[in-house]
């Protein structure tokens, strides 16, 4: 069976084809080659000499037991080599020779027992080394690591490392890899010698499910003393053994580390006294809790120095009353618990993501809700009922506002967005908004993107609601049950580039409303019920138009619509997916491509 | 279409068939077997994925006695610092994991429940596997 040609001469997918040897019928120019799940078993010298341009080679699960000297010798351009799931028993000292450009080496689940005799010391370009899910017992980084000056990621997770000694990291003292991210998760650790990490600098250290008791965790964290780490990730996994006890003493040792960003990722334990628990983390710049259960989050001190707080997929007793002086970014998403938003006091806040929490807002939106006048980004999407009762007083700096898939109330009672002269992006898609007030978008003089799909309009008519949106470049009015539009609805939108009118209920097409759209490039009228033109004589669309989508409409391929069908043919160079433009009537022409019809008035005879 | 039996409990019988053409082997054990009136137990999965499990989610299509419920999307792996350790599993890496589950107080009517589980993962998104579970429920059986 032949390989699948994904990109001609470049990418070939030969997965699970029962190949016993490397195929020799692929182009020399091949850059990406997937040979995974083939029983190759043995790689001899120059196994890949036919592919000198190769950049990515996937040999996952190829039952490889032996890799000989120079197996990859010809692959000087190879940047990624994947060996996952091969039961390697014999790895020659020169197995990886010739890989002068290799940046990523994945040797996950390859029976690797030690880093010491892994022959990669010459791979100077290596950026990522993944040796997870192996049999490595010692964390001693061999001397050859001093050659790997570009190494950024070292994944040693799911190995058998139990202890870390001062001598294990000696090589990092000789040449500090300032950007190294190290994952030691799922190693059964019980001892870290104090001083082992002293004066070591890491970009990221991940320790999840490493400790089988609170005491072990405490002593191991104390063993990290002196470490300077940009991002520290601690925690557990839901499907692994979890700590039976967790209290404020667990993280005391973190006071002896220098941490820029901290994340606690999944904890099968109910946290209550969080102010004491995170006592050593009051001055990290970014603090993150993922999948953690917390009863009270009103105990964070106003003085905590966090600039970014992230609470994701957590469970709360009630919405947290957050009062934090320095906070600039708050990400609070996909959480459960407190269903009603309550005021926060975040005077420095610029970025706020409150999406996907099922929250209801008794009132929205004012500076008093968030305690800031600096807010630039606000995402309230995928929440519950949001009652619009203030027009963003004090929030005039907003540039990005997203309400999609929340239920907006009182949208047509006043000019909700009147204060938002700096707003660039607004998404009110699928918000149950019924437009019954022409001033709905008053004030949005800087708006560039407006998404309002899945809403409705009074009498299914689009009125002149965009008159102030002179900078608009993108407008989505799809799924709005529209049947008609004002001939002047788009007259002020001279910058508009993309207009989506798909999935509405238009029965005819008219070019007149688009005459002022001098910048229009994309017009989507797919999934309507267009049968014909509104007027007999259709004018041209703006000359800027490059893509016109009329697919999945109800074209009437009858004599009386001959001029419309001819007009469509004349627009051929603009039309996209023409094969999906089919006749709906008459029944004998149903399903026929509109453009393949011979339009003569013999059609209906 | 070959049917794979999972287990029987006091009120349910569970089996599955593949609904994709690949039919890559997957081993599923439930201990103790699910009782629909209330249940607590361990789901054990042994599987060698044909693509990375990063950003894994399930599309669930549930049918209750021929009535179709709306499609549900269950995100399992968000892509970083995920809840489950298998979210970091790579294509070709053995996934051998045990997941605890519990639910209670759901009253199911007697009948045939079908659940099509479409597992989607990776970037670009592609189907990992598709299984159709059939649960025969007899509330009063011993």
């Amino acid at each position: 069976e032949p390989c699948v040609e994904v990109v001609p001469n470049i990418t070939y997918q030969c997965m699970e084809l029962n190949f016993y040897k490397i195929p020799d019928n692929l182009p020399f120019s091949t850059k990406n080659l997937d040979l995974s799940f083939n029983p190759l078993r043995h790689l001899g010298s120059y196994s890949f000499f036919s592919f000198p341009e190769l950049q990515v080679l996937d040999l996952s699960r190829c039952e490889i037991q032996t890799i000989e000297d120079g197996a990859y010798q010809s692959l000087s351009h190879l940047s990624t080599l994947i060996l996952t799931g091969n039961p390697i028993q014999s790895l020659a000292l020169g197995a990886f020779s010739g890989l002068s450009s290799l940046q990523k080496l994945v040797a996950v689940e390859t029976n690797l027992a030690s880093l010491e005799n892994f022959p990669i010391g010459h791979l100077k370009t290596l950026k990522e080394l993944n040796v997870a899910h192996n049999l490595i017992q010692s964390f001693k980084l061999p001397e050859y690591f001093s050659n790997l000056t570009n190494l950024e990621h070292l994944d040693l997770s799911s190995n058998k490392i139990q202890s870390i000694y001062c001598t294990d990291l000696r090589v990092l003292h000789q040449m500090p890899l300032l950007n190294l991210s190290l994952d030691l998760s799922l190693n059964p650790m019980n001892f870290i010698q104090p001083g082992a990490f002293k004066e070591i600098r890491l970009h990221k250290l991940t320790l999840r499910n490493n400790f089988d008791s609170l005491n072990v965790m405490k002593t191991c964290i104390q063993g990290l003393a002196g470490l300077e780490v940009h991002r520290l990730v601690l925690g557990e996994f839901r499907n692994e053994g979890n700590l039976e006890k967790f209290d404020k003493s667990a993280l005391e040792g973190l006071c002896n580390l220098t941490i820029e960003e901290f994340r606690l990722a999944y904890l099968d334990y109910y946290l209550d006294d969080i102010i004491d628990l995170f006592n050593c983390l009051t001055n990290v710049s970014s603090f993150s809790l993922v999948s953690v259960t917390i009863e009270r989050v009103k105990d964070f001190s106003y003085n905590f120095g966090w600039q970014h707080l992230e609470l994701v997929n957590c469970k709360f007793g009630q919405f947290p009353t957050l009062k934090l002086k320095s906070l600039k970014r708050l990400t609070f998403t996909s959480n459960k618990g407190g269903n009603a938003f309550s005021e926060v006091d975040l005077p420095s806040l610029e970025f706020l993501d409150l999406s996907r929490n099922g929250l209801s807002f008794k009132g929205c939106c004012s500076q008093s809700d968030f305690g800031t006048t600096s807010l630039k980004y606000l995402d309230l999407s995928f929440n519950g009922v949001i009652t619009m009762s203030s027009n963003f007083l004090g929030l005039e700096q907003l540039e990005h506002l997203d309400f999609q898939h929340s239920n907006l109330k009182q949208m047509s009672e006043f000019s909700v967005f009147l204060s938002l002269r700096n707003l660039i992006y607004l998404d009110i898609s699928h918000t149950h908004t019924r437009v019954a007030f022409n001033g709905i978008f008053n004030g949005l003089s800087s708006l560039e993107v407006l998404k309002m799909a899945g809403n409705s309009f009074q009498e299914n008519f689009l009125p002149d609601i965009f008159t102030e949106l002179r900078n608009l470049t993108f407008l989505d009015l799809s799924q709005c049950q529209l049947e008609q539009l004002s001939p002047t609805a788009f007259n002020s939108l001279s910058s508009l580039q993309v207009l989506n009118m798909s999935h509405n209920n238009f029965f005819s097409l008219d070019t007149f409303p688009y005459k002022c759209l001098n910048s229009l490039q994309v017009l989507d009228y797919s999934l309507n019920h267009i049968m014909t033109s509104k007027k007999q004589e259709l004018q041209h669309f703006p000359s800027s138009l490059a893509f016109l989508n009329l697919t999945q409409n109800d074209f009437a391929c009858t004599c009386e619509h001959q001029s419309f069908l001819q007009w469509i043919k004349d627009q051929r160079q603009l039309l996209v997916e023409v094969e999906r433009m089919e006749c709906a009537t008459p029944s004998d022409k149903q399903g026929m491509p509109v453009l393949s019809l011979n339009i003569t008035c013999q059609m209906n005879k | 279409q070959k049917q794979y039996w999972v287990c029987n409990s006091s009120d349910a019988s569970i089996s599955y068939t593949y609904c994709d053409k690949m039919q890559y082997p997957i081993s599923i054990n439930v201990n103790p077997c699910i009782e629909l009136k209330r249940s607590k137990g361990l789901l054990h999965i042994f599987y060698i994925p044909r693509r990375d499990l990063k950003q894994l989610y399930f599309n669930l299509y549930i049918t209750v006695n021929t009535m179709n419920l709306p499609k549900r999307k269950e995100v399992i792996c968000r892509g970083s610092d995920d809840d489950y350790s298998f979210c970091r599993a790579l294509k070709g890496e053995t996934v051998n994991t045990t997941i605890s589950f519990s639910f209670k107080g759901i009253k199911f009517s007697k009948g045939k429940y079908k659940c099509v589980v479409e597992a989607i993962s990776g970037s670009p998104e592609e189907m990992l596997f598709c299984l159709e579970f059939v649960i025969l429920h007899q509330p009063n059986s011993n």
Epitope: Y302, D345, G363, C364, S366, Q367, F370 | -
Partner: antibody, heavy 118, light 107 residues
Framework: QVQLQESGPGLVKPSDTLSLTCAVS?????????WHWIRQPPGKGLEWMGY???????DFNPSLKTRITISRDTSKNQFSLKLSSVTAVDTAVYYC???????????WGQGTLVTVSS | EIVLTQSPDFQSVTPKEKVTITCRAS??????LHWYQQKPDQSPKLLIK???HAISGVPSRFSGSGSGTDFTLTINSLEAEDAATYYC?????????FGGGTKVEIK
């Protein structure tokens, strides 16, 4: 500059309903914040009574819940307090105030004394 | 509800002297505590929020400290115009509550 001004009768009979109004200038009561009533019996401390949010939502001190109503007139930019079935212990200086998100009160009216007496 | 206990109830102090007023909460309220000054026949005036953050325009001799359950308001060098009653307020949870007050008198 936000200013608050209480007004209403200074004398109310026992069992009657006490009614006060707070006129706000310098800020719209529908524009943001929550608007509160706080009272202070002569020679005693301060007691928080309840509030009306800019959205119209109200909440009260549990000790007064059965007797208190707070409403607003947005056209006049004012909010009102009604306290039913008053007794002598309701004699106090009544303040209206605006709360900020810290849950502190930076803006207060000057207060109005209401005496409950027959 | 959170009960705030102020002490002392009354303090008579000579000018330029240091005044210390304490406020104890019945449960931990982090640093969500505010201080007010009320002069006779006037409405209260916010002095300090979040235990230690002075409000702009408030003289620098006023300072606050504390966290959890124990809080202190300090007037470093008392002046005649500081004669007033001082109240602490719980800003942690509803119902909002005030301390009983501390009356500071000039000797």
């Amino acid at each position: 500059q936000v200013q608050l001004q209480e007004s209403g009768p200074g004398l109310v009979k026992p069992s009657d309903t006490l009614s006060l109004t707070c006129a706000v200038s310098g800020y719209s009561i529908t524009g943001g914040y929550s608007w509160h009533w706080i009272r202070q019996p002569p020679g005693k401390g301060l007691e928080w009574m309840g509030y009306i949010h800019y959205s119209g939502y109200t909440d009260f001190n549990p000790s007064l819940k059965t007797r208190i109503t707070i409403s607003r007139d947005t056209s006049k930019n004012q909010f009102s307090l009604k306290l039913s079935s008053v007794t002598a212990v309701d004699t106090a200086v009544y303040y209206c105030a605006r709360k900020d998100p810290s849950d502190a009160f930076p803006y207060w009216g000057q207060g109005t004394l209401v005496t409950v007496s027959s | 509800e959170i009960v705030l206990t102020q002490s002392p109830d009354f303090q008579s102090v000579t000018p330029k002297e240091k005044v210390t007023i304490t406020c104890r909460a019945s449960q931990s309220i982090s640093d969500h505590l505010h201080w007010y000054q009320q002069k006779p026949d006037q409405s209260p005036k916010l002095l300090i929020k979040y235990a230690s953050h002075a409000i702009s325009g408030v003289p620098s001799r006023f300072s606050g400290s504390g966290s959890g359950t124990d809080f202190t308001l300090t007037i470093n060098s008392l002046e005649a115009e500081d004669a007033a009653t001082y109240y602490c307020q719980n800003g942690h949870s509803f119902p909002l509550t005030f301390g009983g007050g501390t009356k500071v008198e000039i000797k």
